[in-house]
C-alpha cells in the first residue's frame, strides 16, 4: 500500500516588532516534533502595520486597536483556526518606546496597556507586550542570524546551505540599525569585556558564548538625522540651513518644535529666533560625513578602546551580518554586493549625494519623497557609523555582509526573541535521535 501523508504536525508563533518608525508582525512556523533542533523554525509571513510606530499614539491611544487590526486579521487567515489558541503572540517594543519612557513611564505604560488589551481580543495565546532592552535587542538579533546560518548546529557539513556560510562554527557578529537605536553584538577573540554592562554569557546547544553587545540609543538613522539637524541649526546665521546631506535643489521646511520633540536632541537645544527653518540641500558627501562625525564623541574613553561616547568596544572579530536599515538603505543604493569595496561604496555615495533632487525624483518616481530624500544622509551615516563609530576599515569591510533574509526569514531580533521565550534553544545539545517516523504511515 502507498504511504499516505498525515496532517502536518506544526506549530506557529507570532512576534510583533514595535519599532520607532513602524510595527511589523512576523509569523513563524516549525515542525512540532523538532522543536529543539537548530534551524527548523522559519518565517512564513511578514505584515507591515500601516502607520507610524506605537510611541506616536501617545495622545491618541484609542486608535491603537484599529491600527493593529489588518495585520492581526492577516495572522488569523495564515494560521489554521485549529492552531489559533495555542499560537503564542509576543510584542516587543524597541527604542521609540524607550525614548517615550524616558519622558514618562506612565505614558509608555498607557500605550502598552492599550496594545495589550487590543491584542488580547484575538483568539491567539497572547503572552504580553513589553519594552525590550537594548541589550536584549542586540542579543536576540545575534541569536537570530546565527540560528538561521546554522552556527549552533554541531553537525559539520561538506556543503553550504546559506550564501554567507564559511562552513565553520565561528559565529557571525550582528549589526542592527533601526530608526532610533543601533546595536553591535559579537563574540570577541579572547578579549576581556571590560564593561560588565556590555557582557552576555550564553550556553546554547552545549556550547558557551561570551558575547559583547551595546545598543546606542539615539543613533538609529532617524534620530541621528534629528541630532544632526539640531546641531547644525545652532550655528546657522538665519532660518536657512544649507545641508550637505540632502541633494542639490532639495528644500524642506522643519518646525523647531518638531526638532526638539525627542530626548535625542536635548544636548543641542537652544532658543532660536525663528519657529521654522528651511533645509536647502547642497549634496556634498564629504561635508555630510564631517557633520555626522560631530555626533560621535571620540575624545573620551575610560577603557582600552571605545566605539564613541565613552562606550567600550573590543577589537572587531570575524564576519558580521548587517541587517534592518543597514540592509534596506544599502539595498536601495545597490551597495549590498560582496564584491563592492569600501572605497567603491564611498565613491558611489559621493556621486549619489551630488545628483540633483529633480533628477533623483525622476529616477526613483515610485519611491515616497520623504524616504527618497533621506537616502543620501542614511548611506553616509551608515559609512560613518561603521568606519569611524565601530572602527571597520577598508580591509575589514569585506567581513560585513548586508543581509535582508536568511533562508526566507528576516534578519532581526524577533526570531531570537521567540526562540528564547518558547524555550526552543536548549542549553545542552539534544541527544541525536533516528529520523522521525511520525510523518508517514
Amino acid at each position: 500500500t502507498q504511504n499516505k501523508a498525515l496532517p502536518e504536525n506544526v506549530k506557529y508563533g507570532i512576534v510583533l516588532d514595535a519599532g520607532s518608525s513602524h510595527t511589523s508582525l512576523y509569523i513563524y512556523k516549525w515542525p512540532a516534533e523538532k522543536e529543539n533542533d537548530t534551524g527548523v523554525v522559519h518565517q512564513v509571513e511578514e505584515c507591515r502595520v500601516k502607520g507610524p510606530g506605537i510611541s506616536k499614539f501617545v495622545q491618541k491611544v484609542n486608535e491603537i486597536g484599529i491600527y493593529l487590526t489588518d495585520c492581526m486579521e492577516r495572522a488569523r487567515e495564515v494560521i489554521p483556526r485549529s492552531q489559533h489558541q495555542e499560537t503564542p503572540v509576543y510584542l516587543g517594543a524597541t527604542a521609540g518606546m524607550r525614548l517615550l519612557r524616558m519622558e514618562s513611564e506612565e505614558l509608555a505604560d498607557r500605550v502598552l496597556d492599550v496594545v495589550e488589551r487590543s491584542l488580547s481580543n484575538y483568539p491567539f495565546d497572547f503572552q504580553g507586550a513589553r519594552i525590550i532592552t537594548g541589550q536584549e535587542e542586540g542579543a536576540y538579533g545575534w541569536i537570530t542570524i546565527n540560528y538561521l546560518l546554522g552556527k549552533f548546529s554541531q553537525k559539520t557539513r561538506w556543503f553550504s546551505i546559506v550564501p554567507y556560510e564559511t562552513n565553520n562554527q565561528e559565529t557571525f557578529g550582528a549589526l542592527d540599525l533601526g530608526g532610533a537605536s543601533t546595536q553591535v553584538t559579537f563574540v570577541p577573540q579572547n578579549q576581556t569585556i571590560e564593561s560588565p554592562d556590555n557582557a552576555l554569557q550564553f550556553r546554547l546547544y552545549g556550547k558557551d558564548y561570551n558575547v559583547y553587545t551595546h545598543s546606542f540609543l539615539c543613533y538609529g538613522k532617524d534620530q541621528a538625522l534629528w541630532q544632526k539637524l539640531a546641531k547644525d541649526i545652532q550655528v546657522a546665521s538665519n532660518e536657512i540651513l544649507r545641508d550637505p546631506c540632502f541633494h542639490p535643489g532639495y528644500k524642506k521646511v522643519v518646525n523647531v518644535s518638531d526638532l526638539y520633540k525627542t530626548p535625542c536632541t536635548k544636548r543641542f537645544e537652544m532658543t532660536l529666533p525663528f519657529q521654522q527653518f528651511e533645509i536647502q540641500g547642497i549634496g556634498n558627501y564629504q561635508q555630510c560625513h564631517q557633520s555626522i562625525l560631530e555626533l560621535f564623541n571620540t575624545s573620551y574613553c575610560p577603557y582600552s578602546q571605545c566605539a564613541f561616547n565613552g562606550i567600550f568596544l573590543p577589537p572587531l572579530q570575524g564576519d558580521f551580518g548587517a541587517f534592518s536599515a543597514f540592509y534596506f538603505v544599502m539595498k536601495f543604493l545597490n551597495l549590498t554586493s560582496e564584491k563592492v569595496s569600501q572605497e567603491k561604496v564611498t565613491e558611489m555615495m559621493k556621486k549619489f549625494c551630488a545628483q540633483p533632487w529633480e533628477e533623483i525624483k525622476t529616477s526613483y518616481a515610485g519611491v515616497k519623497e520623504k524616504y527618497l530624500s533621506e537616502y543620501c544622509f542614511s548611506g553616509t551615516y551608515i559609512l560613518s557609523l561603521l568606519l569611524q563609530g565601530y572602527h571597520f576599515t577598508a580591509d575589514s569591510w569585506e567581513h560585513i555582509h548586508f543581509i535582508g533574509k536568511i533562508q526566507g526569514s528576516d534578519a532581526g531580533w524577533t526570531l531570537g526573541y521567540m526562540l528564547n521565550l518558547t524555550n526552543m534553544i536548549p542549553a545542552e545539545q539534544p541527544l541525536s535521535t533516528p529520523l522521525s517516523h511520525s510523518t508517514y504511515v
Epitope: M102, S104, K261, T262, T265
Partner: antibody, heavy 123, light 105 residues
C-alpha cells in the same frame, strides 16, 4: 537647590487674558516635565496642564481646554501659562510644579512646587 | 476622569499609628502618590508610585496598595504631622483626592 518662582498673577476681569510665568533654577530644566496645578481658596488641588520634558505630550484638564496654553522656553528655564477667556471659577492659587522621575524615566507625579501665584477673576 | 475618594478627616493621638485611605474609581496600577499640605504652604511630596519614600521624608511615612485601593500610613504620628493629605493618580491625566485632614487629639 531646586527653586520654582511664579509671576504674572493678579486681578483680572472675566473674559480677559493673563500670562503666568515660572522661572526654574537648581536643576537641568529641559530634562523634566513641568505642570501647572491650581488650588481655589479653601479647596483641593486641581491639575491644569502638563508639558513633558520634550514636547511629546502636552495635555490639559477639560475645564481649561481651548482657553489655556502651556508652553516652555528651555533656554530661559521658563514655563508659561497663557490664560484666555477667564472665568470666575478660574480664581485660584496657581502652582508651577516639576514632574518627578522614576530612576531614568519621567514620572507624572510632582516632586517640587513653587510658592504659587494668585489669580483672581472678578468684575 | 479617575475619581479618587478619601475620608474627609481623622483625629489621632501622638505616638499612634494612622492609616489614610484612597480609593480610585478605576484601576491605576501602582501610579498613586501622596502629598502633605500644611496651612499656607505648598504641597510636599511624601510617597511616589504607591510605596516609594520621597527624598527627605521621615521613615514614619509609608505607602501601600495597587489597583484601586491605597493607604498612607504614619507610624508613629507626631504633632508636626497635622496637615491635609492628598492622594494623586497618574495612570490617566492627573487627578487628586479631596484631601484628608489629620488632626491631633
Amino acid at each position: 537647590e531646586v527653586q520654582l518662582v511664579e509671576s504674572g498673577g493678579g486681578l483680572v476681569q472675566p473674559g480677559r487674558s493673563l500670562k503666568l510665568s515660572c522661572l526654574a533654577s537648581g536643576f537641568t530644566f529641559n530634562n523634566y516635565g513641568m505642570n501647572w496645578i491650581r488650588q481655589a481658596p479653601g479647596k483641593g488641588l486641581e491639575w491644569v496642564a502638563s508639558f513633558s520634558s520634550s514636547s511629546t505630550y502636552i495635555s490639559y484638564a477639560d475645564t481649561v481646554k481651548g482657553r489655556f496654553t502651556i508652553s516652555r522656553e528651555n533656554a530661559k528655564n521658563t514655563l508659561y501659562l497663557q490664560m484666555t477667556s477667564l472665568r470666575s471659577e478660574d480664581t485660584a492659587l496657581y502652582y508651577c510644579v516639576r514632574h518627578g522621575r522614576y530612576g531614568g524615566y519621567g514620572g507624572f507625579y510632582f516632586d517640587y512646587w513653587g510658592q504659587g501665584v494668585m489669580v483672581t477673576v472678578s468684575s | 476622569d479617575t475619581v479618587l475618594t478619601q475620608s474627609p478627616a481623622l483625629a489621632v493621638s501622638p505616638g499612634e499609628r494612622v492609616s489614610i485611605s484612597c480609593r480610585a474609581s478605576e484601576g491605576v496600577k501602582s501610579y498613586m502618590h501622596w502629598y502633605q499640605q500644611k496651612p499656607g504652604q505648598q504641597p510636599k511630596l511624601l510617597i511616589y508610585k504607591a510605596s516609594n519614600l520621597a527624598s527627605g521624608v521621615p521613615a514614619r511615612f509609608s505607602g501601600s496598595g495597587s489597583g484601586t485601593d491605597f493607604t498612607l500610613t504614619i507610624d508613629p504620628v507626631e504633632a508636626d504631622d497635622t496637615a491635609t493629605y492628598f492622594c494623586q493618580q497618574s495612570w490617566n491625566d492627573p487627578t487628586f483626592g479631596a484631601g484628608t485632614k489629620l488632626e491631633l487629639k
